[in-house]
């Protein structure tokens, strides 16, 4: 598994470097997670042909994965820093159950899947410190999450492969949109 941000050899070799700002730390954390997703997608794509399926075909699923929309204030049109930050944090909290599902879905990248999950928890903490309006952030219901997890794990093999692929792709897209918006803040 890759070394978490702030612990790579370059950082060790440069002890007198300026400490990262909050924004830089968040940026680095998201890029670290994106690297992890990329590694997991490699294993998924090598194992099944899901990656060749068209976006349209894959859209026909009943997963309620978080997605950025115009109203969330994270795009240039209607950009709103506070609304967007709330959406990013809420979305990441909603992704947590799906990241839990990904655990045990990988053979050679088990550690990587765990790293993505743990790094996302850290990212949420970083972002919560940045947010002013924490009251607007709704936390998913644990009971609902538990039953969703049970339902996903009970799917047949083909559907589980499809679900894994969709989670990784949607999470990647969500993080990309989040980071682009955060770079405007």
């Amino acid at each position: 598994a890759p070394v978490p941000p702030g612990e790579d050899s370059k950082d060790v070799a440069a002890p007198h470097r300026q400490p990262l700002t909050s924004s830089e730390r968040i940026d680095k954390q998201i890029r670290y997670i994106l690297d992890g997703i990329s590694a997991l997608r490699k294993e998924t794509c090598n194992k099944s042909n899901m990656c060749e399926s068209s976006k349209e075909a894959l859209a026909e699923n009943n997963l309620n994965l978080p997605k950025m929309a115009e109203k969330d204030g994270c795009f240039q049109s209607g950009f709103n820093e506070e609304t967007c930050l709330v959406k990013i944090i809420t979305g990441l909290l909603e992704f947590e159950v799906y990241l839990e599902y990904l655990q045990n879905r990988f053979e050679s990248s088990e550690e990587q899947a765990r790293a993505v999950q743990m790094s996302t928890k850290v990212l949420i903490q970083f972002l919560q410190k940045k947010a002013k309006n924490l009251d607007a952030i709704t936390t998913p219901d644990p009971t609902t999450n538990a039953s969703l997890l049970t339902k996903l794990q009970a799917q047949n093999q083909w559907l589980q492969d499809m679900t894994t692929h969709l989670i990784l792709r949607s999470f990647k897209e969500f993080l990309q949109s989040s980071l682009r918006a955060l770079r405007q803040m």
Epitope: F75, K172, E173, Q176, L179, R180, R183
Partner: nanobody
């Protein structure tokens, strides 16, 4: 890293249009975000527009918003910058840059590959 090549620059009259292209032979260009920057003589290089791996995620500098349009054709490994209503102050060398994370941004540091640039001159 990907090798980027810009084309489409030239001399155009104020109010005219140009379409710049940024192309690469890189197989996975579709997963990169691409930004356009420009540098006028004696000035700093500045952000113009960018497009994410998801083509709907586009951002523009205030000075070009409504006049310039960024788009991508992943089948052709090309990103375009359509420039309408050109003004003399748009005169600059235009550079495209790629970000392997598919994110982009309005600062040069977010990009890991750069092209050599194409000259755009707006003059009567």
């Amino acid at each position: 890293e990907v090798q980027l090549v810009e084309s489409g620059g030239g001399l155009v009259q104020p109010g005219g249009s140009l379409k710049l292209s940024c192309t690469t032979s890189g197989r996975r260009f579709s997963s990169y975000a691409v930004g356009w920057f420009r540098q006028a003589p004696g000035k700093e290089r500045e952000f113009v527009a960018d497009i994410g791996e998801q083509a709907e995620n586009t951002w523009y500098a205030e000075s070009v918003l409504g006049r310039f349009t960024i788009s991508r054709d992943d089948a052709k490994n090309t990103v375009y910058l359509e420039m309408d209503g050109l003004k003399p102050e748009d005169t600059a060398v235009y550079y495209c840059a790629a970000d392997k994370y598919g994110v982009g941004g309005n600062a040069q540091g977010y990009y890991d590959s750069w092209g050599q640039g194409t000259q755009v001159t707006v003059s009567s």
